[in-house]
Every structure is written in C-alpha cells, then in structure tokens.
C-alpha cells in the first residue's frame, strides 16, 4: 500500500510568494512559494495519486506582517482552504500566549492539531481540552494512518506558553501514545512534530512503532541528487535512521518558509512495515502557477495589511540614529533600542535563581539600514521600521561559549574604520576596545550582565562558560564574517520576525527615548 506524504514546516507567515531568499517578493517572475502556488501543486498530486496526506510540522505563526495583523486567523483560514490533514504545534504557535493559539487557530482549524508532549493543567485543562490532541487516526483510502504530534520541550524558553502547559520530553511522551495506537490496531504511524532534526532522529531511533518522522524547527533541507536552489542539503531525502529494534525509519523535513513542498512516497506491507521510501522536496518556483482562487483570496486579505503599515505604533521623542556613520563606528541609540527590544521579547521568568534566562544581545551594525527622524510628530510606523530592518530576518536565541563571544567582538573591530557592517551593537554587554592594539587583540574589557542574580549587574566574561545570546539569524548563520558563531554555536533556536519584535516593544513602551549610554567604549 502506497502513501504519499506532502509536508511543510516553519512556513512562518509566508502566505504570499517570496524571493528566492524568502524575503519580500520583488520580481514576480522569479518568486517562489506562497499558499496559492502550494495549493496548485498539492491539488495536482491529489488528482494523480490515490493516498495523499498533507501535513504541517509547526511554526506557521510568526514571520511577516501577515501574522502581526491577523494573529493566526490567516493560518487557520488558508490551511483550511488547502485542506491540510493535520498539523503539529510548533514553539511559535505560543508567541501570542495560549489565548493567541486557542481563539484564532485551535477553534477555527478544520483539521486536527497535535502534540503528545504538551499537557495542560489547572484552569486551562478544561478550557483547552479537545482543541489539540496527542494523536489522530486518519482514514486514507481503505486504510488508517495514525499521526502523533510533538513540540519542542524548549518552548517555555522560546515562546509564551504560560504556566499551565507542561512540555514533557518528546520520547517519553510519544511512546505511550504510539502504544495506544498499536492496541487500536493502527499499524502505520507517522510522528509529526517540531523539535528539530536531532530530536527527529532520536524519535526515529527510540520510539517503538513509529514508521515515519516528519519534522520541523531546525529548517533542515534534505535532498537526494542535485539540489534545485541555493539550500545545501544536510543529508539525503529521506534521511534513514535505524531504530533500536532494527527497522529503517525515514525522517524528513522540508527546509522552511513554504519554499518547498516535501514529497515522500512510502510503501507499506500488509503488516504496516515500511518496505520502501523515496522522494524529494519540490521547489515551488514560478514554473508552478499560483492558483487563481487562492490568489484572489490572498489579495482580499492583503488590503488590511497595507492599511496597517502606515498606522502609528508609538512615538519617539529622540532622533533614532540608525545611520551607517554611527552604527558601523560606535554605539548608536537605534542599536540600543533594537537590542533592548530583543531582550524584552525574550523575558521568560525561569525560576527563583534567574531573573531571566538570557540577558545579552548582539546586532551587526550593518543590519541597521535607516534612521527614524523624531521631527515627524515622533510617529513610528511599521513602514518606518521596515526601512530600518528591511531584510525580513529573525532575532534568534543561541548558546555560545564565552571564548566564541570574545572572538566575535574581536571580529567586530578587526578592520575598524572602513564602514563595514560587522561592528556590533549590544545589549547586556559592556565592551571596551583599544584600537591601537593589533587586530585579534583589541578587546580589553568585556563584561556581561548576569542572569543568575536577583539584581542584574555586570561581571567579566568567562571563557569557558556557556551563555545565551539573542542575535539576528544573519549572525547565527555566520553572516558578516562571523564564521566563529556558526561553527561554534552549541544551540540555535529561530526566533521572532525582527520588525515584529521592535514594533511590539514600541507599542508596549508607547513613548521611547533610547540613549547612547556607554555600552561600547574605546580606550
């Protein structure tokens, strides 16, 4: 019996087609993805093949102005229109709290939303009961397929799920649910979830009875043969894991941002064993036309976005200096504003020992593309922020050793004075440079804000300690020459859309007046 699994993950609000790098579409003839194009391909496969499932492995939320404005209603509407069969909860589905998940998505979705390792407690338990499920048995042709969901157990550190949701270990939580499916005589089981490729592989290895793993979170691109675009494969598609009980389990993921549609064909024998698996992600490029009816619906929903981008978010009573003359040479108040917003967006009270789980921010000065003049009645709009942060990136959470951070700050000034973008703006860090010293030895003082303290204060950076840092995804991926970050990071979790982080902070503060306050000094 042959099953076709179509899958997406980490779409992150890319409802409209995008450029090849998943930023805003500029030249329509070269654009990719988007739900209208996705629908065309899905329908084409549904017409051609008998047993098809369309699955999403989480993180539909967060990433463009679509989410900022519609807050998840757009996800429910267009996923319903595409007739998704199931979705797993990702960490970003909790970005607007549990209410921001329940009302727009859980209550509106016409497909099951799954996670076996999220357990509700207290007053939330009855409120959310039945709105998401640990698993769902789906009829496919004459057969049934069990889909069991999972979500990153790190979600409380990455989003805002509140105190009434417990995120259990994925493997521990999945096994009893899979066992339950087996007792219901379901012998074809897909684990669909959002914990990253390493965890996906562990699930394939450790959870008895899982036949296929469809994952997300790590934006992993897998491909067999010559890849069709710029993404470099992390392995073959499907990636085969040998389970502890001796079975070959295919593991798949489909990069991110709706650029590809994962396409996996599985052949099962009469006992429910996977006897063959093959496929590849399908690049959703302009050779695939956008479906006219979905496109028309997108255009209708688009109108509200255009209105939103000119509305006032808040006010500034000072000039927001985002000029390259400042931000690539010294501390600039636009850099301070953005870093403060980044930390504020990551406030998660960990426990009594920690005031927060992260206190530090770094931001490449070259990523700040425009100032904002306060003399326009102080008004700040989304449109203004889009000029400051035009690249559609994310502000991510990484874990780095102190020694890696030291290298990063040396790189920040290794060719100082040439107006290059690698000069770092900071938050929760005090750095002193001596430019008279040779490159690679210019950082003379590097103090960082403690997290394991009730009163935050600055302590010298320890080379062997592991620190959490918020930074642009551009830096996490080694951009602007920060190869040491890419090579040495110990963990990387993608975060929220950059503009959204700053706009939310400005809306929250109402009036802002960031200063230059001695975060970066020269001796």
């Amino acid at each position: 019996w042959e099953l076709t699994i179509l899958h997406t993950n980490d779409v992150h609000s890319r409802l409209e087609q995008t450029s090849e790098d998943s930023s805003k579409c500029v030249n329509a003839s070269r654009c990719m993805g988007g739900v209208a194009r996705l629908f065309t391909k899905v329908q084409q496969i549904r017409r051609a093949e008998p047993n098809v499932l369309l699955l999403d492995a989480g993180d539909q939320y967060q990433g463009t102005i679509w989410f900022t404005v519609y807050k998840g209603a757009e996800v429910a509407h267009f996923m319903n229109a595409l007739r998704y069969d199931a979705m797993a909860l990702g960490n970003h589905e909790f970005d607007n709290g549990v209410e921001g998940l329940i009302e727009p998505l859980l209550k509106e979705a016409k497909f099951p939303i799954l996670s076996a390792n999220i357990k509700a407690k207290g007053p939330l338990a009855s409120q959310i009961s039945g709105l998401y499920l640990p698993y769902k048995v789906l009829p496919v042709g004459d057969e049934v397929v069990g889909i069991v969901g999972y979500t990153s157990k790190e979600t409380p550190f990455l989003s805002n799920p509140g105190t009434n949701l417990v995120f259990e270990d994925e493997i521990t939580a999945l096994q009893p649910e899979v066992d339950k499916l087996k007792t219901l005589n379901v012998n074809k089981i897909i684990a669909l979830g959002h914990s990253g490729f390493e965890t996906d592989k562990l699930i394939a290895q450790k959870v008895r009875g899982v036949d296929v793993v469809v994952g997300g979170h790590s934006n992993t691109f897998l491909y067999t043969g010559n890849p069709p675009s710029k993404e470099v494969p992390a392995g073959k598609y499907p990636f085969i894991v040998t389970s502890d009980d001796g079975r070959k389990v295919p593991v798949v993921q489909a990069y991110a941002f709706g650029k590809y549609l994962g396409y996996l064909k599985i052949e099962f024998d009469e006992r429910g064993n996977v006897i063959s698996s093959h496929g590849n992600p399908i690049l959703l490029n302009s050779s695939i036309p956008e479906d006219p009816s979905i496109k028309a619906d997108i255009n209708k929903w688009r109108i509200k976005l255009d209105n939103y981008s000119t509305q006032e978010l808040g006010k500034t009573i000072v000039y927001l200096d985002g000029s390259s003359q400042s931000c690539r040479f010294r501390e600039c108040n636009m850099g301070n504003l953005i870093c403060d917003a980044m930390i504020n967006n990551n406030l998660r009270h960990a426990d009594e020992m920690f005031w927060n789980h992260v206190s530090m921010c770094i931001l490449n000065g070259g990523g700040i593309r425009s100032p904002i003049d306060e003399r326009n009645n102080g008004t700040i709009t989304w449109e203004n922020l889009a000029a400051v942060l035009p690249f559609g990136g994310t502000f991510d959470l990484v874990q780095l050793k102190g020694s890696t951070l030291k290298k990063a700050f040396e790189h920040s000034v290794h060719r100082y004075g040439q107006s290059t973008g690698e000069f770092l703006q900071v938050g929760g860090i005090h750095v002193v440079y001596d430019l008279s010293r040779k490159p690679g030895d210019r950082v003379v003082k590097l103090d960082v804000l403690c997290t394991k303290c009730r009163v935050p204060s600055y302590d010298p950076l320890k080379m062997d300690e592991i620190y959490k840092v918020i930074l642009p995804n551009f830096l996490a991926n080694g951009g602007d020459g920060f190869q040491m970050i890419k090579d040495e990071l110990l963990r990387h979790d993608s975060g929220d859309q950059d503009i959204n982080v700053v706009s939310t902070y400005i809306s929250k503060m109402k009036v802002i007046y960031p200063a230059v306050e001695g975060r970066i000094k020269f001796s």
């Epitope: 019996w1 004459d142 057969e143 001796g246 070959k248 024998d269 009469e270 064993n273 996977v274 063959s276």
Partner: antibody
Framework: QVQLQQSGAEVVKPGASVKISCKAS????????INWVKQRPGKGLEWIGK????????DYNGNFKGKATLTADKSSSTAYMQLSSLTSEDSAVYFC?????WGQGTLVTVSA | DIQMTQSPSSLSASLGERVSLTCRAS??????LIWLQQEPDGTFKRLIY???SLDSGVPKRFSGSSSGSDYSLTISRLESEDFVDYYC?????????FGGGTKLEIK
Amino acid sequence: QVQLQQSGAEVVKPGASVKISCKASGYVFSSYWINWVKQRPGKGLEWIGKIFPGNGDTDYNGNFKGKATLTADKSSSTAYMQLSSLTSEDSAVYFCAGFADWGQGTLVTVSA
Amino acid sequence: DIQMTQSPSSLSASLGERVSLTCRASQDIGERLIWLQQEPDGTFKRLIYATSSLDSGVPKRFSGSSSGSDYSLTISRLESEDFVDYYCLQYASSPYTFGGGTKLEIK
C-alpha cells in the same frame, strides 16, 4: 494477525487447467498486492506475477503470460491463480504471498 | 530482468558460529531486498525487509546489510533452528527475482 490460507493439493491431467485459491485475513485485502511464486525441487523459486485486489491490476512475469491468470474477489478476500494447458513442467508447489506473509503452499501434480 | 546471484549455495557451519550469505544484484535495486527463511516443511518466513530492517519477532542475531550491489544476511551466532534454507528476493522492478538459495547445514 495476517494469514494467507491456500487451497489443498491438486492432481490434474496434462492439458487440463487448475485454479488454486488463497484466502487472506488480518488486513485490508484490497490495499495490498498478492504475489504468486512457483517452487520446483532443484529449480529454485520463480515469481509468477502479482495482483492488486483493489482494482484488479495485474503484473505478470513474461515467462508465465498465457500460463497463469490471476484474479481476486474482494467480497471474500480471496485471490485465485488459474494455470492452463498443464504439462509435467507445471508440477510444483505454488505459494501466494504478500510482502511479509506467505501461504502454506499448494502442491500441483500433473500426471496422466 | 535483474539477476540475483546468491552465494554460497550450501554452507556447513557449527553452532555458535557467525555466517554471512550474499546476494549480488545485476542492476541497482535501491535496497529493495528481502531475506526469506524456508523451513523443511516448506513454510516461508520473512526475516529482513528493505535490506536491513528486521521483522518483528525475528531474533537480533539476524541482520541485513549492503555494500554497492552486494546484499548480505549475517547470523551472528548460529542456533540449531537456523539450519534451514535461505533466499533473497529483489522487489525493485518487475519481474521480481529470487536468489538461487543457500542451504545451511550443521557441521
């Protein structure tokens, strides 16, 4: 659990036909191919062909086209193989098989 | 048609010994290979599917692997019930084809 139960041994005359059956249980019969295999002592195993009961699709080994005819009855979850114009070369044990499970075999003896 | 050349055709070995049987495919079969065990009464049992996946209920002393066009079944420590016949079967392309079989005998 999955079971494939074949009909009993047959003794047939040369030139005649024989139809052997394979009743399936423990799974959705219409969703999986049923294979037929021939085993003769000292001749190893030969794949005859397969049938997809859901729509009756068949796929034959060229060596058995015209010799074997595969059919299936969804209502009784039974697959059939008819062998025609029998000769002594057709004397063998015939097995039906899924991908995982095999029938117990049916001995066909062609003898005058 | 894809030829499956199975070797050895017979093998004498002792209890507790480790043995390997090999099937060589004449064309690429993309790991679509089954190993079957046939009891003296004619009963077939599948041991391995998809080259290396172990069927449920099959002892872990059985394992399958591949290297290029060579596919192997290894029994790590022979037990008395293992002295029977073994066949490989490719299901990559029609007509499916079997190896000639290996008779495993006790020394």
